[in-house]
Interface confidence: medium
């Protein structure tokens, strides 16, 4: 840090410099400090956000920004329809310029960009763009968040109504409504060429007060490809004077940016004022802490179908900054199928986003109830190729819960997959806040977004008059590096099933209040930051931001035939084509693993594998997805093992064991039934066997206890 002494009252943000002087017609002033002394403020220290209220009273208001947006608390507002953009597709003129204000980097827009719709009271004109970022390597830097997920960068575009005011500054000074769009930037493997003019400009304003003209850019290309899914709320400026005059539009889909491009933000300098000492420091973490929602309501857009593609990949396949917590988003496409009367097959697909590659292996956690007793096991799937496992020795009259977690290097873990419940003759799926009838066992329409850690210890709660008993399972984790990885699928007892009406009779709906909205806080020595995740009713696996995907298909046994061997570019554009089909990998005969017992550890993990990463922009090929955005997401096929015999009588009390799949050299395009005895409707696991998805209404991981190593049962 460079320090130098100034012998005059330092005004760290004076009038805009040379560029401003050449624009006498400009009414733009970026957080301008007049000589009369607009209050000095900073993002930390003695002039930090907690002190803003002393000089800007509005900063202590009850409708402040930014906020954390909880998707499941947001109501759909019919008035929030499509945004109308005008001028956004035009190239910017050579008068557009960028300035390092010392608090942000701002783009002063010199062209006419208008927005209307989205409930805005009129036609608003874009005035400026500002950025907020973190400190390094994609760390959290956004001001807003969704379900607790923050992003490396947030871009904010500010608008005013030119029919009411002659300038943006006038609107603010007269405390009149302005508009603001918040756009998240998320790390992607490759550079986003649309950002090139911005990144180039950043390199020209490294130092405080520097200004530069920008190369032409298209503002629309800095927005998400899909604009239909957005949140709306009324809030404030996120910097002093914190005026509560802002109609916020927060886009749910992020824009891709590479690590390399992020470095341009992290390279910006500012000058800080402490008494008479001015220091030159990096401008980093220039975000305001989040504010209370208080009595406000967050709305979400009512654009037709805008949210259908967006739930799974965002809400629990986070595209937000998770680098410090988990190594990947959850395994997806969970499926449970009966193989015969004493065996179940669990299959899944690789996570869509890997923060810390590679995945070494997977841990399957399963639990069951028998005569009111609750038992649980964890099993390490010692492969990154064959994404399925067989649980043998199952008992048809027990309820089974399954969930899967990826294990990465350094024992980092992914978020958990959704939990699948399986019980013979059960004919309902619990999906979000409703229970629906199902057909034959198939992939759940719910997604990994639906999984939530249910407990952090043994607790019994009563909600809406229905008692629940939850028992955590050992997961094989040391100190948790993920807020959500400290628990494994908790047992839902038969009491719960009775409460849900599974003992007979139909339930047409299931109140979300039945699930506790907050987990009891365990007295953990070190608490994880809590976050809440929606249990959605329409969550579909998605390829990532800015790519639309139709609902997952479940065309068993057909995928291999559809799979084409593509030639990938040097950067692997099509590297993960049809990646979910890896379980169809050729003949194998793999070792059988018994579920970990209390006195032994699970098999050692093994190797890595490729995985899809966050999407790379609307016009680029997404690894693992066809360029055709209408192509359906593929599903994990569930081949039936041909040679698995019942190992014990179904009536025995022997706990289930998990085995890796055994294959014969049969045609991979056709599913096979067990060779010894085809399943019939008379089998204990019949066509009427179903599975259920547990979707607690909220996920909060605060106070989760870390658990012992695999197989060490408590």
């Amino acid at each position: 840090v460079l320090h130098y002494v100034v012998c005059f009252p330092a005004l760290t943000e004076g009038y805009v410099g040379t560029l401003q002087e050449s624009r006498q017609d400009s009414s733009v002033q970026i957080r301008r400090r007049k000589a009369s002394g607009d209050p000095y403020w900073a993002y930390s220290g003695a002039y930090g956000p907690e002190h803003w209220v002393t000089s800007s009273v509005s900063c202590g208001g009850s409708h402040q920004s930014p906020i954390d947006i909880l998707d499941h608390h947001a109501r759909v507002g019919d008035e929030y329809q499509e945004l109308q953009l005008d001028g956004f597709d035009n190239e910017s003129s050579n008068k557009t310029w960028m300035k390092n204000t010392g608090k942000t980097v701002a783009i002063l827009l010199k062209d006419d960009y208008f927005v209307s719709g989205a409930g805005l009271p009129g036609r608003f004109k874009a005035e400026k763009v500002e950025f907020h970022w973190g400190h390094s390597n994609g760390s959290a830097g956004s001001e807003h968040s969704v379900n607790g997920r923050r992003f490396p960068v947030e871009m904010q575009i500010f608008f005013y109504n030119p029919d009411d005011f002659d300038s943006f500054q006038t609107a603010i000074s007269e405390n009149r409504i302005i508009g603001a769009m918040a756009i998240f930037f998320q790390v992607s493997p490759r550079d986003n060429s649309a950002l090139d003019p911005i990144i180039h400009g950043l390199k020209g304003v490294v130092h405080h007060e520097k200004e530069t003209f920008l190369d032409p850019f298209i503002l629309r290309d800095l927005l998400p490809a899909s604009l239909g899914s957005y949140y709306r709320y009324t809030g404030s400026l996120t910097t002093p004077p914190c005026s509560e005059i802002v109609e916020w539009i927060v886009f749910r889909r992020p824009v891709p940016i590479s690590y390399h491009q992020l470095e341009a933000f992290y390279s910006i300098f500012t000058t800080e004022q402490q008494d008479h000492v001015k220091s030159v420091e990096y401008l980093r973490n220039n975000f305001r802490p989040q504010q209370a929602l208080n009595d406000r309501v967050v709305s979400k857009s009512a654009v037709r179908d805008a949210w259908n593609h967006d739930l799974a990949d965002f809400l629990d396949n986070p595209l937000g900054t998770e680098a410090s917590k988990v190594c990947s988003s959850p395994p997806i496409h969970m499926k449970v199928q009966p193989l015969n009367q004493t065996a179940l097959q669990v299959s899944w697909s690789q996570p869509e986003t890997i923060y810390h590659p590679p995945i070494m292996n997977y841990m399957i956690s399963y639990s069951w109830t028998k005569n009111e007793d609750e038992k649980e096991k964890t099993f390490t799937k010692d492969s990154d190729k064959d994404l399925k496992a067989t649980i043998s020795h199952v008992s048809p009259d027990s309820l089974y819960l399954f969930r899967v977690q990826a294990v990465c290097r350094n024992d980092m873990r992914s978020d958990f997959s959704q939990t699948m419940l399986f019980q013979a003759n059960t004919t309902r799926i619990f999906q979000g806040t409703r229970i629906v009838k199902t057909g034959v066992p198939t992939a759940s329409p719910a997604s990994s977004a639906d999984m939530a850690p249910i407990s952090s210890g043994s607790s019994t709660w009563t909600s809406s008059g229905i008692p629940f008993s939850f028992v955590s399972m050992a997961t094989g984790m040391g100190p948790s590096s993920s807020g959500s990885q400290a628990t494994v699928a908790s047992v839902v007892t038969s009491t719960l099933l009775a409460g849900l009406g599974f003992g007979g009779g139909g339930i047409s709906s299931f109140p979300s209040t039945v699930w506790p909205t907050r987990l009891p806080t365990a007295s953990a020595a070190s608490k994880q930051a809590g976050r809440t995740v929606l249990a959605t009713t329409e969550a579909l696996a998605s390829p990532g931001p800015d790519v639309h995907s139709a609902p997952s298909k479940d065309s068993e046994g057909t995928e291999e035939g559809e799979k084409e061997e593509k030639s990938e570019s040097e950067d692997g554009e099509r590297e993960h084509e049809e990646e979910e089909k890896d379980s169809e990998k050729k003949e194998k005969s793999e070792a059988t693993h018994t579920a970990a017992e209390s006195d032994r550890t699970a098999p050692a993990p093994t190797p890595s594998s490729p995985h899809r990463t966050a999407a790379e922009g609307g016009h680029q090929t997404i690894p693992g997805r066809r360029q055709d955005h209408s192509a359906p997401a593929t599903d994990q096929p569930g081949h039936v093992a041909p040679d698995l015999d019942p190992l014990v009588d179904t009536a025995t009390q022997v706990p289930p064991t998990a085995t890796e799949e055994h294959y014969s050299g049969s045609d991979p395009r056709r599913p096979e039934m067990p060779s010894k005895k085809p399943m019939s409707r008379g089998d204990r696991f019949s066509e009427d066997s179903k599975f259920i998805t547990v979707n607690p209404a909220e996920k909060n991981t605060s106070g989760m206890l870390s658990r012992p190593s695999p197989g060490r049962m408590e």
Epitope: N137, P189, S258, Y259, H260, E263, A323, T353, I354, H356, P357, P358, M360, N361, D382, S383, D384, K385, D386, R409, N410, D411, E565, E570, D571, G572, E575, K585, K588, S589, E590, A604, P605, T606, P607, S608, S609, P610, H611, R612, T613, P623
Partner: antibody, heavy 120, light 111 residues
């Protein structure tokens, strides 16, 4: 174009520490696993270790303690070698994984290599 | 420790098809990559994830895997295919992570 280039290879006497540098162009090292691989004259390829995008390092068992990989910037990775013996004479390559979230020893970009000769 | 085994040398007649193998105890649970290296040059990635070909690699090169054996098949062998071929996989658990190279196979194209 994306490329790698090693530098720092030279003739040194046994026991002399040596640092090799791998310089990337066209991409950021924050996004990829970067491995060092060596090849003794007339022998096969031998993996030394890697550094991932987040700066975590992993080494072959024989390399632990004597070899250190570090990321010195978004475009350079160093391999520091100590306690060198004649057995360490080899061409040293740096190599980049094909895909940022792909880590199965699929290196699609290699440097041309730099020769390190240990001789007394 | 984990070892990938490759035949030291293989001969093939010009225009014929040749298969190079790579075996390991648990290769069925691992992905293999294949490299070609010509004298004095850096290796070139031919196949990754058992079967996938990077762009620019001729489709005469193909990969497969069955059980604990990964195979690189070169159809219509050409004189320019004479080189050393290495298979690679990964191994690891917990904080351990290794990239493992096979010993290499020297392919000679005759005729």
């Amino acid at each position: 174009a994306q490329s790698l280039e090693e530098s720092g290879g030279r003739l040194v006497t046994p026991g002399t520490p040596l640092t090799l540098t791998c310089t990337a162009s066209g991409f950021s090292l924050y996004s990829y696993d970067m491995s060092w691989v060596r090849q003794a004259p007339g022998k096969g390829l031998e993996w030394i270790g890697l550094i991932d995008g987040g700066g975590n390092t992993y080494y072959a068992s024989w390399a632990k303690g004597r070899f250190t990989i570090s990321k010195t910037s978004s475009t350079t990775v160093d391999l520091k070698m100590t306690s060198l013996t004649t057995e360490d004479t080899a061409t040293y390559f740096c190599a980049r994984e094909l895909w940022p979230a792909y880590s199965s020893g699929a290196f699609n970009i290699w440097g041309p290599g730099t020769l390190v000769t240990i001789s007394s | 420790s984990f070892v990938l085994t490759q035949p030291a040398s293989v001969q093939v007649n010009l225009g014929q098809t040749v298969s190079l193998t790579c075996t390991a105890d648990t290769l069925s649970r691992r992905y293999a990559s294949w490299y070609q290296q010509k004298p004095g040059q850096a290796p070139v990635l031919l196949i990754y994830r058992d079967t996938r070909r990077p762009s620019g690699v001729p489709d005469r090169f193909s990969g497969s895997s069955s059980g604990n054996t990964a195979t690189l098949t070169i159809s219509g062998a050409q004189a320019g295919d004479e080189a050393d071929y290495y298979c690679v996989t990964t191994d690891g658990s917990g904080s351990s992570y290794l990239v493992v190279f096979g010993g290499g196979t020297q392919l000679t194209v005759t005729g």
